[in-house]
Structures are given as structure tokens and as C-alpha cells.
């Protein structure tokens, strides 16, 4: 067996079992679980005389380790005296010593409850610069207690003079506060409040909680996009399972149809997320006619960690239909960005909310990554609206200054599409009737000022431009207008855009 240091326990009688007139009393110290022999036990009896006797070591049968007991008999004024049993085990190390200090007898006592509370996060859910830990030691029979704070098991140098004790009836409570810097708290260390009372140790520990508390697994089932349904004519639906914890269990996604007819072969993809979760998607091709005729599709998700299967179903949206209105705009040139322009497309008052937005240039559809389109939002009425934004380059508009914003929606006729063309420089592209109208003059400034119209997307014309006020009931819907630079001595230039 390898070297093992002893565990040391005080041996005392219950105070109520010692006669009040007893002139001498015996207490003991048990050293157990050590190897090899020997241990040396000495006693500190203070001012009292005492006789000691150390019993021969016995072997613990299971482990082969040793145990021994040392007894101390004292006489005189022992009731108020504390005694220290000192156990040394030189085989463990030359300076290995364990001290136990205790009184002759143990009283019946109610042990304390130890609980650490921590200060709250700020309103935004972030940790403040300092974190307070409060150790509540409550409900114990009044007596001496020692509080020690540990950081990852190491004793901390803490001012304990702030600890306060109160008595409630026959029981007492004490509290001690520890203030930590945010850096220490976020370092993932464990903080322990250790309480020593009547020769016993009680403790509670805490640490910063994991960044992402485990959430329940969620499943979502999407409808086919109108573009896939009406233009590509190869619609798919996707079952998405999120917030799966890392596990050895397999996620099964099973497809079915309410009609009981067979489903096509699905494709599956698994992706790891930086927040430590797994996302699983299964994409199922569906028949265009089946979907339009109202077939319902179901996705069933099973996983060993789920208490029961998750079921999700999808079908064509019911309710009233309304075709989208499409409006396309070009923002003006912005100082420092002469070779780039932003085009905006407002699509509104459509029902249901399923819509696909595309941009085309030179009769070619631009990749989806080129534009950014909002999720459908409800209008004040019963329909929905979206905005789509496309950045174009000078090379593109000089090649052909016409860009098309196209909405694909089931209520649009005749071919489920509505589109609008927009030019970066409509005034230079043949001069529309709009650009010939003499506008009402209102000065536009580069900063937004009260009472002045503001260009869509937060941009405004050149600071030295006059702008048409648009409609008299401004701010009404934005309108296209002409701006003429008023700088004298320079060739005037026109700008057509939004004010």
C-alpha cells in the first residue's frame, strides 16, 4: 500500500452524561486510515494537568491501513477549558501535523444552514464591475463559528470584521460578504463559504453559471417559397430542429402526408453552432399540384433526449388573397460614394404573407446574397409589407441603367409576379415627364431638420440642392422630384431622387 496520511477525529462525551460533580473526565482523539506506522499523538492541556494513554494501533481489515486512539484524562476546572490533540505522521512528510481543538464534552446543538447568495446582473443582463457574494449562516445554536472564504479550494485573504451575527429566539444567524472583481468572477473559479462550528465543517459553493443555459429542443416547419413553387416549379419544405445538445443519440426526422400518400426522398443536413448546440434540417421536395390543392405535410422529430416526439405540420395558408403593390426607388448620390448606389423596393398590401423578392439586371436574376429583404410585417390594414435593398455599382448602371424588383406571390396575376423597373439616373435616361415639372422649392440640408423632408434610407440630396416639397400634406408617401444645384458659375446638374 502507498503512504496515506491519517484522518483525525475528536472523541467527546455528551455534556448531559457527565455528572456535574465529576472531578476528572476523559476525552480522546482517533487517528485512522494512515499507512505506514507510526503516528505521534500529543496533547495541549493548557493550565490543567492530564494523563495520556495511546492505545496500540489496529489494522483496518479492508484497506490494510492503521487506526489508533489516544486518551486524555484531566482533572480540575475542565468545563471551560479547550484541549488540542496534535497528530503527527512523519511518513507522509516530516512536517505533517493535524490539530483538533475541542472541549471536554459536546452539547446538543442545531447545526447551521450555509447558503451563498449573489448580487444581481444589471438591467441589461450583464455583470457589474464588482460582484457581491453573501454567505448566510442561519438557524444554529448560539456559539462560536468561524467563516472562511475559499477560491478554488484555496483560503482567501478576506476581511471578516464585516460579518454580523443576530439572534432570533434560541437560534443565531451570521452573514459574511465577499466582493469580487468582474474579472475574477468571469474566470470560472469556484467560491466556497466554509463554516466551522462545534468541530464540524459546513459549506456552500458557487460559480458563474454557464453562458447558455440549456434550452428545450425546438422544431420548425417552413412552407415552400413562392419562387420555388411558381417560377422554378420545384417546391420544397424544410423541417428545422434547433438547440440540440451534443449527444451520441441520433435525431430522426420522419416525413408523412395527411392523405397517407408516399413522400419523396428528403435530404438532411447537420450543423454545429458556436453556442454549443446542433441544428438539424431535413428538406422534402413536394409536388406543386399537391401543395396548391392543400395537402398537409408532417415532420416527426425523435431523439433519445426528448421525452416525446415533436410533431410539426404545414399546409397552404388559408384566408383572403391580395396581390402585392411594388414600388422601386433609387437613392441619390452620397458624397464619397460616387461609384455605388442603393436601390430600394417597397412591396405592400399582399396576403398571405408568403412572398419571394428578386432583383434582375440585364434580364438576369441577381444572386439572393446581393440583396437584403426584411421579413414580412403586418400593415395597419390586413395585408403585409416588405422592404428590399440592393447595392449596385457604377459599372452595372453604366452597362444598363435599368434594374427590376420582382415580387413572386400567389395572388399576383397573371403569372404570380409583379415587377417594377428603377434607374439610378432617370433624368439622364431620356428625361421623364416627372423631370420636366417645375417643383415647389424647399431647401434640403445634409442634416435632418424639422419640417424638411428626408430622403428614403436616411440619405438626402447635395447640401446645395433645392427639392420639391412633394405633396402638400407632407409627410405623405415619398415622391420622386428633381433637385437643381444652385451654385452660381457652375454648370447646373440635375438629381432625381427621394426627398
Amino acid at each position: 500500500a502507498s503512504t496515506q496520511s491519517p484522518s483525525v477525529f475528536p472523541l467527546t462525551r455528551c455534556c448531559k452524561n457527565i455528572p456535574s460533580n465529576a472531578t476528572s473526565v476523559t476525552l480522546g482523539c482517533l487517528a485512522t486510515g494512515y499507512f505506514p506506522e507510526p503516528v505521534m499523538v500529543t496533547w495541549d492541556t493548557g493550565s490543567l494537568n492530564g494523563t495520556t494513554m495511546t492505545l496500540p494501533a489496529t489494522t483496518l481489515t479492508l484497506s490494510g491501513h492503521y487506526a489508533t486512539i489516544s486518551l486524555l484524562t484531566v482533572s480540575g476546572a475542565w468545563a471551560k477549558q479547550m484541549f488540542t490533540c496534535r497528530v503527527a505522521h512523519t511518513p507522509s512528510s516530516t512536517d505533517w501535523v493535524d490539530n483538533k481543538t475541542f472541549s471536554v464534552c459536546s452539547r446538543d446543538f442545531t447545526p447551521p444552514t450555509v447558503k451563498i447568495l449573489q448580487s444581481s446582473c444589471d438591467g441589461g443582463g450583464h455583470f457589474p464591475p464588482t460582484i457581491q457574494l453573501l454567505c448566510l449562516v442561519s438557524g444554529y445554536t448560539p456559539g462560536t463559528i468561524n467563516i472562511t472564504w475559499l477560491e478554488d479550494g484555496q483560503v482567501m485573504d478576506v476581511d471578516l470584521s464585516t460579518a454580523s451575527t443576530t439572534q432570533e429566539g434560541e437560534l443565531a444567524s451570521t452573514q459574511s460578504e465577499l466582493t469580487l472583481s468582474q474579472k475574477h468572477w468571469l474566470s470560472d473559479r469556484t467560491y466556497t463559504c466554509q463554516v466551522t462550528y462545534q468541530g464540524h465543517t459546513f459549506e456552500d459553493s458557487t460559480k458563474k453559471c454557464a453562458d447558455s443555459n440549456p434550452r428545450g429542443v425546438s422544431a420548425y416547419l417552413s412552407r415552400p417559397s413562392p419562387f420555388d413553387l411558381f417560377i422554378r416549379k420545384s417546391p420544397t419544405i424544410t423541417c428545422l430542429v434547433v438547440d440540440l445538445a451534443p449527444s451520441k443519440g441520433t435525431v430522426n426526422l420522419t416525413w408523412s402526408r395527411a392523405s397517407g400518400k408516399p413522400v419523396n426522398h428528403s435530404t438532411r443536413k447537420e450543423e454545429k453552432q458556436r453556442n454549443g448546440t446542433l441544428t438539424v434540417t431535413s428538406t422534402l421536395p413536394v409536388g406543386t399540384r399537391d401543395w396548391i390543392e392543400g395537402e398537409t405535410y408532417q415532420c416527426r422529430v425523435t431523439h433519445p433526449h426528448l421525452p416525446r416526439a415533436l410533431m410539426r405540420s404545414t399546409t397552404k395558408t388559408s384566408g383572403p388573397r391580395a396581390a402585392p403593390e411594388v414600388y422601386a426607388f433609387a437613392t441619390p448620390e452620397w458624397p464619397g460614394s460616387r461609384d455605388k448606389r442603393t436601390l430600394a423596393c417597397l412591396i405592400q398590401n399582399f396576403m398571405p404573407e408568403d412572398i419571394s423578392v428578386q432583383w434582375l439586371h440585364n434580364e438576369v436574376q441577381l444572386p439572393d446574397a446581393r440583396h437584403s429583404t426584411t421579413q414580412p410585417r403586418k400593415t395597419k390594414g390586413s395585408g403585409f409589407f416588405v422592404f428590399s435593398r440592393l447595392e449596385v455599382t457604377r459599372a452595372e448602371w453604366e452597362q444598363k441603367d435599368e434594374f427590376i424588383c420582382r415580387a413572386v406571390h400567389e395572388a399576383a396575376s397573371p403569372s404570380q409576379t409583379v415587377q417594377r423597373a428603377v434607374s439610378v439616373n432617370p433624368g439622364l435616361a431620356g428625361g421623364s415627364a416627372q423631370s420636366q415639372r417645375a417643383p415647389d422649392r424647399v431647401l434640403c440640408h445634409s442634416g435632418q431638420q424639422q419640417g424638411l423632408p428626408r430622403a428614403a434610407g436616411g440619405s438626402v440630396p447635395h447640401p446645395r440642392c433645392h427639392c420639391g416639397a412633394g405633396r402638400a400634406d407632407w409627410p405623405g408617401p415619398p415622391e420622386l422630384d428633381v433637385c437643381v444645384e444652385e451654385a452660381e458659375g457652375e454648370a447646373p446638374w440635375t438629381w432625381t431622387g427621394l426627398c
Partner: antibody, heavy 114, light 110 residues
Amino acid sequence: SLEESGGRLVTPGTPLTLTCTASGFSLSSYHMSWVRQAPGKGLEWIGVINSAGNTYYASWAKGRFTVSKTSTTVDLNLTSLTTEDTATYFCARYVFSSGSHDIWGPGTLVTVSS
Amino acid sequence: AYDMTQTPASVEVAVGGTVTIKCQASQSIGSWLAWYQQKPGQPPKELIYGTSTLESGVPSRFIGSGSGTEFTLTISGVECADAATYYCQQGYSEDNIDNAFGGGTEVVVK
């Protein structure tokens, strides 16, 4: 279980193919990794082939090592071998949903020496 | 690149003691971290996956913790059988990496 084979003593520049034979599970359901360990050194990830047959390699292994598979075996092709490639080569089953390797073969030793 | 740095390279611990091994990722890997134990002449054995989930049959004295870029393996109540080399491995990305494994920590039990 997994068992590697094909390890032997070769001279620098000699190409070599190591084979990992799987039993008890289907390679079509799991990713498979190759990992090597030079004598007295740590584990070095070479590459992985996923259930669909797509491959990913450590940046240092691209171009010199190729992973491929059949229904029951996974191969590691080693080209332009140098003495630095002397190592025990392990194949391991990679569970994508846990991000870990749960079954390992005993390894096969490749010694490159002139 | 997702590179793993493991410390210390070697540690000595007494039977019954506690040993702590740290693993640092060069960028966040969430909780996609596994720990392995390898004894001489044997292949590695999986201990922990998902930062803290014990593989079946692994004693509860092995504890994994951490998230993001900082991870820890703690072995408490060390036994002679725990003498081995321990490796961490990131399981977040299979792409753009030099080595999925940390350099290893040799645990010597006295």
C-alpha cells in the same frame, strides 16, 4: 470495431495506402477520421470523410493525404512520404452530433526510412 | 484556424489528490470539446464529450467544464489507473484547422 492495416517499412517518396475495416456499424451513417501519432509525440488529426463521402483535411495534410471509402472500408492514401511521417496511424469513428471520436482502431505503424 | 493549446505538458499527483488540465481554443468552439485518455501502446479512449458529458462507463471523478475558448478537465480522488496522457479535441469545425487535438498532458501518479 475498427482495424487498420497496410502499415509497413517504406523508403521516402514511396506511396502507401492504409485501410480501415469497420464491423458492427454502417459507414454510411458515420464520419470516419484518420489520426496519427509519431513515436513519443501527441495525436495529430489528418482528415475526415463524412457519411456522404465529403472529405476535410488538416491544413498540413492537404494534397499529400487522401481519404476515401467503400461500404465497409476507409482508405488513407499517403504520397510523398518523408521520415517525418513515421507514426502509428489510427482510424476512428467520428460522431458528428457529439463532436467526438468514440471508437478507435488499435493503429498501424508506418515507418519511413532510407 | 481552430488550434488547441493544452497545459501543463506534464503533472505529478499523489493518489487521492486532484489534478486539473486546461485546454484553450484559438477561437470559440461553444461546448464542442472532447477529452481522451491514452495509455502507452493503446489507442485513445473517449472520456468526455460536449465539454462535460461523461462517456458511459467513465468514473464520475472525471469532470469536464468550460465553454467558448477555455476548458478544464479535473480528476479528483486520483487513482493509480489514472496515470496516462490526456488529450482535448475540438469538435466544432472540420475545416480550416492544423490539429483538432491539444498537445497532451502526461499525468504521473505517485
